[in-house]
């Protein structure tokens, strides 16, 4: 009852002729345990006895031994894992045919076929390919043989056209109750060079002697692979020769359907066939040039030919870094040529005439100077000739005024408070002139660019400046006017003494100025309009108070005269002509009132008195005037008065009072 | 006719400051393409250019020296001046003054015309 | 810094060609170098003989020309004379310096 058996094994077994089988065996019964196992060699059912007939391989019994059983046949299962593994080593081709499990357990019987392939020689393994192959795309290649065995060693190895292929392959068996095989892959990118070539998976034994092999030929797709020609076979020519470019497929697959021609990256118009001709070439068609055929793969492009049209220099241009430039500044100047090939020489010419000595692209002035303004042309040299040297360039060289003078256009001399007019000269600038810029700065006019009118000129004003401006400022030298003026700040300065004058003293008196042009003068001393001297000094040997007075000293050049203010000449002195005066006479009646008044001449004025009699007798009174009220007759007598001033003292000549008697008294009497 | 007369101290001492005049007659450093330039020469050996100033007041200097120079000029003195900061026994030479111009008619400097030079010693 | 290298003697004859050369550490002397070339005679009286490569200054004998020899400045004295018996300085100029050669000593065999 095949329901109560499950038997599992790979069904067929392949191997050949010296070569061994192994195979994998598993079972299962429902009701008890394997009892006797018998392998046949093509049984038959005898129906008459009820029994298989056959060749019996192996044979196990209940006790397990193996009575009459070939040695290259063993059984490597066991009844305990349900194991029904077997090999035969070596296996004949005569071993063809079925091998019959005939499994008998307590309550049942089953006979299991498998199916033994044993070929004379060693049979092929098989090379599996993915159904596409294209340039570039990694696939796996397998090679798959239906053997493996313990007993017999076997390799798989890959070649290409014959050669041993580098990359590693992973070889695997099986060796399971599903399958029976020897499989080898290999990792491979197929280039559009191995479209066509045969790759075959050898079976080596043991030895590495080849056993069998299989072949496939790729069929690898790809883009178009090309190369272009060029006839000539120079790509160097020259402006009107001919040239023709021919694009060789040398390989697609499939086979290729548009071709199209490209310069520099942008098709051409109407170049569609593999041949592509340029009559009398121009310079612009120097240019790097490839072809471009597609197939259903995608588009391919040659490696591109850079096609050089030679020609004599064209006329050329002068580049300048900058202009207008700076005095002092960095020019360059580039000669721009177009030639091909590049001109190897160049002449630089600056207002026609060749600059010496410069024959490069570049020609550098390391510091402009005005005389390098001009036009600068050039003319490039290459193995074609000369080119037509271009109308050139002109270079402006700016640079601050030069030269800058100042002219006083007056006639000299200059005196103070004329007008005076003075012009601003320069010899050459670039830019010109458009401003004019005077030192010191005053409110001065400026009728016309560059000339300054000063009106009224001080007597100060010594130097004047001027400067020309355009982008810049260049100033002159000062010029001195040398304004003439009458002397200024005249004054009287006391030389000596250096304290207060004192009557006796020595004194001089100095007729100072502050500046004079011209510088020679004269001097003069007044004194309430009388003149006293004409020295800068004037001297006393002994002042006395009548010396006091106001004193002015005048300078004089040939410009003028100057007066200096007036100056108070104070003279001290102690008190000088002291008298005593009486203002009602020197008689006076008794009981009247005496005054009598202390007159003197003094500087300071006198701030102390004093009063005496006949005997030198001090009075008690210290005022200028002594007041006798009311007189008697014995005040009469005479009188002297003293007085005092920091300077000094003085005192007055006697003086007599005489009191007489008052009609009453003598009435009295 | 163009001359330069270098003139300075002689003799000084390390970390000393060195000055050195150049008086120059027949141009003038207001006049466009002349400059001044200063080389030394050490005993028995080459030329070293220290630096130059041109009328436009660009001034260049040795890269090695620059921190330690100065140049100057007075244009209406006719002077040109240099000063070598914390001077050192290395500069020990002979210090000359040369005009560089720029010719007219011409595109590039010239060192045209030399002093005679002034010799200098660092001594401690 | 570059280093300026000149031959350090030269012996010619009245009446021969002589070349200098002048040879920059930082590669081919070009015309932005302005090569300059000085003479220096007995006493230290130095003398400018040419600038910007090719120039000769105001005043020099047609006799000493100045040019560019590969890749290096070159002073030639054609037809030498013996007064011309001198140290020859070569200096170049890198974009803010001059650098001087060590110097060539050129006797004239009388």
């Known amino acids: 009852d095949s329901s109560k058996w499950n038997i599992e094994h790979p069904g067929t077994i392949y191997a050949w002729e010296g070569a061994c089988v192994w195979v994998p065996c598993t079972y299962r019964v429902l009701d008890g345990a394997l009892e006797t196992f018998i392998l046949f060699h093509n049984p038959e059912y005898n129906q008459n006895m009820s029994k298989f007939e056959g060749t019996r391989l192996y044979e196990s019994t209940k006790d397990g031994k193996v009575p009459s059983g070939q040695k290259r046949v063993q059984f490597l299962g066991n009844k305990i894992n349900n194991n029904c593994t077997l090999s035969i080593h070596p296996v004949h081709v005569n071993d063809s045919g079925q091998l019959g499990l005939r499994m008998v357990s307590k309550t049942e019987k089953w006979m299991e076929r498998i199916h033994l392939n044993v070929s004379e020689r060693p049979f092929p393994p098989r090379i599996q390919l993915p159904p596409k192959l294209q340039e570039s795309q990694e696939v796996t290649l397998t090679c798959l043989l239906n053997f493996s065995c313990y007993g017999y060693q076997i390799q798989l190895q890959w070649l290409l056209e014959g050669v041993p292929m580098r990359q590693a392959a992973v070889t695997s068996t099986s060796l399971s109750t599903k399958s029976v095989f020897t499989r080898s892959e290999l990792k491979f990118s197929p280039q559009w060079s191995h479209h066509g070539k045969i790759v075959t998976c050898e079976l080596h034994d043991v030895d590495g002697k080849v056993l069998s092999e299989d072949m496939v030929q790729l069929n690898v797709k790809h883009t178009p692979k090309l190369t272009i020609e060029v006839t000539p076979n120079e790509t160097i020519v020259r402006k009107g020769d001919s040239v023709t470019m021919t694009c060789k497929v040398n390989s697609s697959n499939p086979e290729y359907t548009t071709v199209s021609w490209l310069k520099d990256g942008i098709p051409l118009k109407e170049q569609n066939t593999l041949m592509l001709t340029l009559h009398e070439v121009t310079k612009s068609q120097t240019g790097r040039y490839c072809c471009r055929v597609s197939n259903d793969v995608g588009p391919a492009t040659s490696e591109k030919v850079f096609l050089q049209v030679q020609y004599a220099p064209e006329p050329s241009r002068v580049q300048i870094s900058q202009s207008p430039a700076v005095e002092g500044s960095e020019v360059n100047f580039l000669c721009i040529s177009p030639a091909n090939p590049l001109p190897t020489n160049y002449t630089w010419y600056h207002n026609g005439k060749e600059v010496q000595g410069r024959t490069e692209k570049q020609f550098q002035i390391q510091k402009i100077l005005p005389w390098h303004a001009g036009t600068y042309s050039c003319e490039a040299e290459n193995i074609l000739g000369i080119g037509e040297r271009g109308p050139g360039t002109e270079l402006d060289v700016q640079y601050p005024p030069k030269k800058v003078t100042m002219v006083i256009e007056n006639p000299t001399p200059i005196r103070e408070g004329d007008t005076v007019t003075l012009s601003c000269n320069y010899s050459s600038s670039n830019p010109i002139v458009n401003h004019y810029e005077w030192r010191p700065r005053g409110a001065w006019e400026e009728p016309s660019l560059g000339v300054l009118k000063i009106q009224n000129i001080g007597w100060n004003n010594t130097a004047v400046a001027c400067a020309a401006c355009n982008n810049w400022c260049s100033w002159a030298s000062p010029v001195t006017l040398n304004v003439l003026y009458a002397p200024r700040g005249v004054r009287v300065r006391k030389i000596k003494p250096l304290s207060e004058i004192h009557s006796g003293n020595s004194v001089s008196l100095q007729c100072d100025f502050s500046s004079s042009h011209p510088k020679e003068v004269q001097f003069f001393w007044e004194k309430n309009g009388s003149l006293l001297g004409k020295e800068s000094q004037l001297n006393f040997d002994s002042i006395s108070p009548e010396d006091a007075g106001s004193y002015s000293c005048w300078v004089n050049n040939s410009i003028g005269q100057t007066a200096s203010k007036a100056w108070t000449l104070e003279v001290l002195y102690a008190p000088r002509r002291l008298r005593v005066s009486m203002s009602q006479g020197n008689q006076v009646m008794e009981g009247k009132t005496a005054t009598l008044t202390c007159e003197s001449d003094a500087n300071p004025p006198v701030y102390s008195y004093a009063w005496f009699d006949w005997n030198n007798q001090s009075l008690p009174y210290s005022g200028r005037m002594l007041r006798l009220e009311p007189v008697k007759v014995q005040h009469s007598g005479a009188y002297w008065c003293q007085g005092t001033n920091r300077v000094g003292k003085g005192h007055s000549p006697l003086i007599t009072l005489t009191v007489y008697y008052s009609p009453q008294t003598i009435g009295r009497r | 006719q163009v001359t330069l007369k270098e003139s300075g101290p002689g003799i000084l001492q390390p970390s000393q400051t060195l000055s050195l005049t150049c008086s120059f007659s027949?141009?003038?450093?207001?006049?466009?393409?002349?400059?001044v330039g200063w080389i030394r020469q050490p005993s028995g050996k080459g030329l070293e250019w220290l630096a130059h100033?041109?009328?436009?007041?660009?001034?260049y200097y040795n890269p090695a020296l620059k921190s330690r120079l100065t140049i100057s000029k007075d244009t209406s003195k006719n002077q040109v001046f240099l000063k070598i900061a914390n001077v050192d026994t290395a500069d020990t030479a002979t210090y000359y003054c040369?005009?560089?111009?720029?010719?007219?008619?011409?595109?590039?400097?010239?060192?045209?015309?030399w002093g005679t030079g002034t010799t200098v010693t660092v001594s401690a | 810094q570059a280093v300026v290298t000149q031959e350090s003697a030269l012996t010619t004859s009245p009446g021969e060609t002589v070349t200098l050369t002048c040879r920059s550490s930082?590669?081919?002397?070009?015309?932005?170098?302005?090569a300059n070339w000085v003479q220096e005679k007995p006493d230290h009286l130095f003398t400018g003989l040419i600038g910007?490569?090719?120039n000769r200054a105001p005043g020099v004998p047609a006799r000493f020309s100045g040019s560019l020899i590969g890749d290096k400045a070159a002073l030639t004295i054609t037809g030498a004379q013996t007064e011309d018996e001198a140290i020859y300085f070569c200096?170049?100029?890198?974009?803010?310096?001059?650098?001087f050669g060590s110097g060539t000593k050129v006797t004239v065999l009388g």
């Open positions: 040369a005009r560089i111009s720029i010719p007219y008619g011409y595109y590039d400097w010239f060192f045209d015309v």
């Open positions: 027949g141009f003038s450093l207001s006049t466009s393409g002349m400059g």
């Open positions: 100033i041109w009328w436009d007041d660009d001034e």
């Open positions: 930082t590669g081919a002397v070009t015309t932005r170098n302005y």
């Open positions: 910007g490569t090719n």
């Open positions: 200096a170049l100029w890198y974009s803010n310096h001059f650098i």
